[in-house]
């Protein structure tokens, strides 16, 4: 399996935005890479977002995705937005080298993202 | 050494308040106990607050202390307030059985407290 590294802990900003780097030890030069972010909480794993990109190009997530990202070599800079306290959990980076063959798969140990809901601002009278 | 247990991670609220339980495996019933909270960051250890209490009585911190607490048996419920993002760090619970002799000392592994500064509220025009 391909090695994937990601930070152990990240704090979301008070605006509910969390960013982290997902780095993979590519055995060669892939031209097509797929990155998927999975969330694990209470032993349930759900897909948060996914993007396939051509090396040297930007990552393109779906328009309604809560993720954005950029790539540089074997590093992917991922940003997840719109997070609430209830979204606190382990976010796992999964990397697949799609082309050329052979196919490689790597799964990181996960980044624990902590999210704190902000206090509401007082009403302006 | 006496065993002291405390949670690995706690998130401060958006108001900068963090609470955690410090539990010590007492060899019996001490009548006088001292609890100290230490903060470790960048290999520097500083004392955050300390209180000596008689079993069955409330913990009394100094008036200007950022800590408050209650005790129940071998558990101390600690609250630290006024925390800012720069206060993020490892908060270590140290428990000393002061009386009767012999003296016992226990130091926990620390609670990583994460603090996120809130976004300022917009000015009301």
């Amino acid at each position: 399996a391909m090695h994937v590294a990601q930070p152990a802990v990240v704090l979301a900003s008070s605006r509910g935005i969390a960013s982290f780097v997902c780095e993979y030890a590519s055995p060669g030069k892939a031209t097509e890479v797929r990155v998927t972010v999975l969330r694990q909480a209470d032993s349930q794993v759900t897909e948060v977002c996914a993007a396939t990109y051509m090396m040297g190009n930007e990552l393109t997530f779906l328009d309604d995705s809560i993720c954005t990202g950029t790539s540089s070599g074997n590093q992917v800079n991922l940003t997840i937005q719109g997070l609430r306290a209830m979204d606190t959990g382990l976010y796992i980076c999964k990397v697949e080298l799609m082309y050329p063959p052979p196919y490689y798969l790597g799964i990181g140990n996960g980044t624990q993202i902590y999210v704190i809901d902000p206090e509401p601002c007082p009403d302006s009278d | 050494a006496m065993h002291v247990a405390q949670p690995a991670v706690v998130l401060a609220s958006s108001r900068g308040i963090a609470s955690f339980v410090c539990e010590y495996a007492s060899p019996g019933k001490a009548t006088e106990v001292r609890v100290t909270v230490l903060r470790q960051a960048d290999s520097q250890v500083t004392e955050v607050c300390a209180a000596t209490y008689m079993m069955g009585n409330e913990l009394t911190f100094l008036d200007d202390s950022i800590c408050t607490g209650t005790s129940s048996g071998n558990q101390v419920n600690l609250t630290i307030q006024g925390l800012r993002a720069m206060d993020t760090g490892l908060y270590i619970c140290k428990v000393e059985l002061m009386y009767p002799p012999p003296y016992y000392l226990g130091i926990g592994n620390g609670t990583q407290i994460y603090v996120i500064d809130p976004e300022p509220c917009p000015d009301s025009d």
Epitope: - | K29, G73, P100, P102, Y104
Partner: antibody
Framework: QVQLQESGPGLVKPSQTLSLTCAVS?????????WNWIRQPPGKGLEWIGY???????YYNPSLKSRITISRDTSKNQFSLKLSSVTAVDTAVYYC???????????WGQGTTVTVSS | DIQMTQSPSSLSASVGDRVTITCQAS??????VAWYQQKPGKAPKPLIY???YRYSGVPSRFSGSGSGTDFTFTISSLQPEDIATYFC?????????FGAGTKLELK
């Protein structure tokens, strides 16, 4: 490493006084802890008898209080049990043991058997 | 006095079995409960104190749990050297009291 060692007569006549001593090595009995006597009748459970504290304070099991005295000799680093007016029901293995105040017993002697019989 | 009702009074088990002993206090004793092992002709040895903490040098197969009035002692995988009598003990209130013991035998 603290060590406790009981000594005393193995046979006591009914109505007499049972006397046992516990010699402590490796820790000064006046420095800390509470120094206890516990007994175990043949084939039965454990019964706490009483203690003498590091400060000379005493507390005895109310069920035996009227017949017990626990004293100490700090110069010899030992403490003693006297149980008066014994009967057959006092036949037991007697242990000395150390604890923190109102604590569990972390160190025990090997025990000494006392038989009450005429 | 606080009564410590221990059960069962005797128990037969095989090597590798999970063994559970319970103790019920007649009133709330918090977490001030210890468990001892006693082999014939020997003094009791502390295994667990403060309900769930293993005494120094005690193997991890021994564990304890509970609080208030109900307490459990467990041997996760019985070994031949574990054959002994086990006692619970409350040290919340004087006079300190013990359970009647559980004699553990090999099947």
């Amino acid at each position: 490493q603290v060590q406790l060692q009981e000594s005393g007569p193995g046979l006591v006549k009914p109505s007499q006084t049972l006397s046992l001593t516990c010699a402590v090595s490796g820790y000064s009995i006046s420095s800390g802890y509470y120094w206890n006597w516990i007994r175990q009748p043949p084939g039965k459970g454990l019964e706490w008898i009483g203690y003498i504290g590091y400060d000379g304070s005493n507390y005895y099991n109310p069920s035996l209080k009227s017949r017990i005295t626990i004293s100490r000799d700090t110069s010899k680093n030992q403490f003693s049990l006297k149980l008066s007016s014994v009967t057959a029901v006092d036949t037991a293995v007697y242990y000395c043991a150390r604890n923190y105040y109102s604590g569990y017993f972390d160190s025990w002697g090997q025990g000494t058997t006392v038989t009450v019989s005429s | 006095d606080i009564q410590m009702t221990q059960s069962p009074s005797s128990l037969s088990a095989s090597v590798g079995d999970r063994v559970t002993i319970t103790c019920q206090a007649s009133q709330n004793v918090g977490t001030y409960v210890a468990w001892y092992q006693q082999k014939p002709g020997k003094a009791p040895k502390p295994l667990i104190y403060s309900t769930s903490y293993r005494y120094s040098g005690v193997p991890s197969r021994f564990s304890g749990s509970g609080s208030g009035t109900d307490f459990t002692f467990t041997i996760s995988s019985l070994q031949p050297e574990d054959i002994a009598t086990y006692f619970c003990h409350q040290y919340d209130t004087y006079p300190l009291t013990f359970g009647a013991g559980t004699k553990l035998e090999l099947k």
